[in-house]
């Protein structure tokens, strides 16, 4: 599997999409896991609804949400309030029995918030009638890792 890079801005939300063959993975629940080291296990962060028919319902674990468009074949993961410690290698998985097939390997990169060093006077605050949710822009810049690039720094 190639690794796709998704970049998000610290403090904002990042949306990761994992396309898949909807017929090949029909009836299978999905999961989002974090790779622990280059050869280590993938630790489950969140999985779709226990009933596959309800996979469209968004499920949260802390600040991470997952939802599955089983007809269109797109698994979507939202990382809310992105933090530097969220950076790393993840996988979108398709579950069958106790096994998991990798749908996509994802490298999450967290960019510094450009507003961090500005004066408070320069910051924009929503008015009373506006909600953060409505005003909120989700950044999701993705690319594939170039050949030779490695998602983990080499261990000494």
């Amino acid at each position: 599997h190639n690794t796709t890079v998704f970049q998000g801005v610290a403090g904002q939300s990042l949306q990761v999409s994992c396309p898949y063959d909807s017929m090949k993975h029909w009836g299978r629940r999905k999961a989002w896991c974090r790779q622990l080291g280059e050869k280590g296990p993938c630790q489950r962060v969140v999985s779709t609804h226990n009933l596959w028919l309800l996979s469209f319902l968004r499920r949260w674990n802390g600040s991470t949400a997952i939802t599955d468009d089983t007809l269109g074949g797109t698994l979507t993961i939202t990382l809310r309030n992105l933090q530097p410690h969220d950076a790393g290698l993840y996988q979108c998985q398709s579950l069958h029995g106790s096994e998991a097939d990798t749908l996509r390997k994802v490298l999450v990169e967290v960019l510094a918030d450009p507003l961090d060093h500005r004066d408070a006077g320069d910051l924009w605050f929503p008015g009373e009638s506006e909600s953060f949710e409505d005003a909120h822009v989700e950044h999701s810049i993705s690319r594939s890792l170039l050949e030779g690039e490695i998602p983990f720094p080499p261990t000494s």
Epitope: G27, R29, L51, L53, L95, H96, G97, S98
Partner: antibody
Framework: EVQLVQSGAEVKKPGESLKISCKGS????????IAWVRQMPGKGLEWMGT????????RYSPSFQGQVTISADKSISTAYLQWSSLKASDTAMYFC????????????????WGQGTLVTVSS | DIQMTQSPSSVSASVGDRVTITCRAS??????LAWYQQKPGKAPKLLIY???WLQNGVPSRFSGSGSGTDFTLTISSLQPEDFATYFC?????????FGQGTKLEIK
């Protein structure tokens, strides 16, 4: 009506090659995994491997990896099981089976089976 | 690999009897288990999947139960057409594995 029709019985000599087939009809062949299962004379069932005809993604049992090749041609709704060099111990009945995922528990079960192909390997 | 062990290996019973066949997995497989019936010279037929779900067209005298490592197939009232060999199969992980079979014979 879902049907899996397998090719006829084969009698071969050790060292010969062989390719048997399993043709699906009555459903979208490319969209369901197809498994191959061996049954040696008077014995139980052994899962050999499985293929997704849509993209030819294949999984093998470690016991059969390197011994057989599983392939499929979705354009003619047919899966294949082949040997490059048969042994007397390959004498068995071979079944293909459709693997259907049950959405309630996200695992798959063999809901339709071919009639079987008897392969006899003898000098 | 997960080993599946069936007991008994064979059982003799009469029409109308209630028969129970057990299947034990070498490790927990949740409810990822199927039961098949095979008659001589024929392909296996799916009876039960997900441990307790009856396949379409299978008579209701067949039932399955269990989870984890221990499973049972019960035929509540044997009919003449039920004399056959029964196999359990785990759908938890690759490679898929079957029990060695239980032959149900007429007493």
């Amino acid at each position: 009506e879902v049907q899996l029709v397998q090719s006829g019985a084969e009698v071969k000599k050790p060292g010969e090659s062989l390719k048997i087939s399993c043709k699906g009809s009555g459903y979208s062949f490319a969209s369901y995994w197809i498994a191959w299962v061996r049954q040696m004379p008077g014995k139980g069932l052994e899962w050999m491997g499985t293929i997704y005809p849509g993209d030819s993604d294949t999984r093998y049992s470690p016991s059969f990896q390197g011994q057989v090749t599983i392939s499929a041609d979705k354009s003619i709704s047919t899966a294949y099981l082949q040997w490059s060099s048969l042994k007397a111990s390959d004498t068995a009945m071979y079944f293909c089976a459709r693997s259907r995922t049950f959405y309630y528990d996200s695992s798959d079960y063999f809901d339709y089976w071919g009639q079987g192909t008897l392969v006899t390997v003898s000098s | 690999d997960i080993q599946m062990t069936q007991s008994p290996s064979s059982v003799s019973a009469s029409v109308g009897d209630r028969v129970t066949i057990t299947c034990r997995a070498s490790q927990g497989i949740s409810s990822w288990l199927a039961w098949y019936q095979q008659k001589p010279g024929k392909a296996p037929k799916l009876l039960i999947y997900a441990a307790s779900w009856l396949q379409n067209g299978v008579p209701s005298r067949f039932s399955g139960s269990g989870s984890g490592t221990d499973f049972t197939l019960t035929i509540s009232s044997l009919q003449p057409e039920d004399f056959a060999t029964y196999f359990c199969q785990q759908a938890d992980s690759y490679p898929r594995t079957f029990g060695q079979g239980t032959k149900l014979e007429i007493k």
